[in-house]
């Protein structure tokens, strides 16, 4: 935040900061969630051997996790700010049900799983503010989400471990792509 004339509240050597711009706030928030995902992945990898499974084996799943594609306009070639922003918000909204699923999947990192879920809600809010004039954002149906959640929770232990690992890996990749794209906006 700027200093009022005649005020000085900073370290003498430090340049003064402005209030965070919306982009900086979003950037910090994504870093926060990514750090949370790292902590959750660490617990998952310590608990099961999913992290050693080949990408091909893990790809053989019926989870419809959001993923960035060329048409979404988030990559450097064919970058389109509006299309990309819609994709990021829509993708995060779709991830919410999977983050809800993660809530009972951790023991020592329970608080972090909650923090990742909560922070994703905040991130969506920040992004929706940035995308005020975009109306192409579709919210997943609550009933669809509820039945998907029930289905995921009914899986056997091995499949639940795999699902947890896949969600975390996909969410990390989605956020990293989002972070790169948002830095171009």
């Amino acid at each position: 935040a700027p200093v009022l004339p005649g005020e000085d509240s900073k370290d003498v050597a430090a340049p003064h900061s402005q209030p965070l711009t919306s982009s900086e706030r979003i950037d910090k928030h994504i870093r926060y969630i990514l750090d949370g995902i790292s902590a959750l992945r660490k617990e998952t990898c310590n608990r099961s051997n999913m992290c050693e499974s080949s990408k091909e084996a893990l790809a053989e799943n019926n989870l419809n996790l959001p993923k960035m594609a060329e048409k979404d306009g988030c990559f450097q070639s064919g970058f389109n700010e509006d299309t990309c922003l819609v994709k990021i918000i829509t993708g995060l909204l779709e991830f919410e049900v999977y983050l809800e699923y993660l809530q009972n999947r951790f023991e020592s990192s329970e608080e972090q799983a909650r923090a990742v879920q909560m922070s994703t809600k905040v991130l969506i809010q920040f992004l929706q503010k940035k995308a005020k004039n975009l109306d192409a954002i579709t919210t997943p149906e609550p009933t669809t989400n509820a039945s998907l959640l029930t289905k995921l929770q009914a899986q056997n232990q091995w499949l639940q471990d795999m699902t947890t690992h896949l969600i975390l890996r996909s969410f990390k990749e989605f956020l990293q792509s989002s972070l790169r794209a948002l830095r171009q906006m």
């Epitope: 935040a1 009022l4 430090a14 503010k129």
Partner: antibody
Framework: YPQLVESGGGLVQPGGSLRLSCEAS???????MSWVRQAPGKGLEWVGS????????YYNTKFIDRFTISRDNSKNTLYLQMNSLRAEDTAVYYC?????????WGQGTLVTVSS | AIQMTQSPSSLSASVGDRVTITCQAS??????LAWYQQKPGKAPKLLIY???DRYPEVPSRFSGSGSHEDYTLTISSLQPEDFATYYC?????????FGQGTKLEIK
């Protein structure tokens, strides 16, 4: 476990020093952090903040000569070094994540300055 | 430093009442203002940021409004768990400053 846990509070004599710690979960590694204090029965007062790498620190002018904020990211810990303590520094000290507004807070640690 | 004048300093109300707390800054804030709720012995909890954005999972009965120097927190229908102290905070300028608080008590 809670995401932010302050410690190091206690009874100290006027003129004494104290170092408060705020142990943070790994999520706070890339975040600006602030210290905020609250005297018994009084309102909230911002002490200062620090950027993720610890390069830039911002202080409330009131504390710039006596208080120093630092962090050790390898230990995921934020510190508040308080020197030349006075009776009016008696307060609960909170650490919080700083997005300009504070969206995550520790539970606080009580510092009592008294002879 | 920016002065934040919160009013009233205390307020008695009943469950179901509509309550308004105001915060006046000594300088233009560009909506860079937050509202917090604090219960005895607990840390403050963020309710509203950027003047009127409700933090996720904060009940919809809480709303923020205002511009320039004048801001308002409204609780549309008081619930038993809302009896607490409320603070505004400006983050337009450093040092960040808080209002002196409004203690909301049961009538």
């Amino acid at each position: 476990y809670p995401q932010l846990v302050e410690s190091g509070g206690g009874l100290v004599q006027p003129g004494g020093s104290l170092r408060l710690s705020c142990e943070a979960s790994v999520l706070f590694k890339h975040q600006d952090m602030s210290w905020v204090r609250q005297a018994p029965g009084k309102g909230l007062e911002w002490v200062g903040s620090i950027d993720p790498r610890g390069d830039h620190k911002y202080y409330n002018t009131k504390f710039i000569d006596r208080f120093t904020i630092s962090r050790d990211n390898s230990k995921n810990t934020l510190y508040l070094q308080m020197n030349s303590l006075r009776a009016e520094d008696t307060a609960v000290y909170y650490c919080a994540r700083d997005l300009d507004f504070m969206d995550e807070w520790g539970q606080g640690t009580l510092v009592t300055v008294s002879s | 430093a920016i002065q934040m004048t919160q009013s009233p300093s205390s307020l008695s109300a009943s469950v179901g009442d509509r309550v308004t707390i105001t915060c006046q800054a000594s300088y233009w804030l560009n909506s860079e203002l937050a509202w917090y709720q604090q219960k005895p012995g607990k840390a403050p909890k963020l309710l509203i940021y950027d003047g009127d954005d409700r933090y996720p999972e904060v009940p919809s009965r809480f709303s923020g409004s205002g511009s320039h120097e004048d801001y308002t927190l409204t609780i549309s229908s008081l619930q038993p768990e809302d009896f607490a102290t409320y603070y505004c905070q400006q983050y337009r300028y450093t040092p960040y400053t808080f209002g002196q608080g409004t203690k909301l008590e049961i009538k």
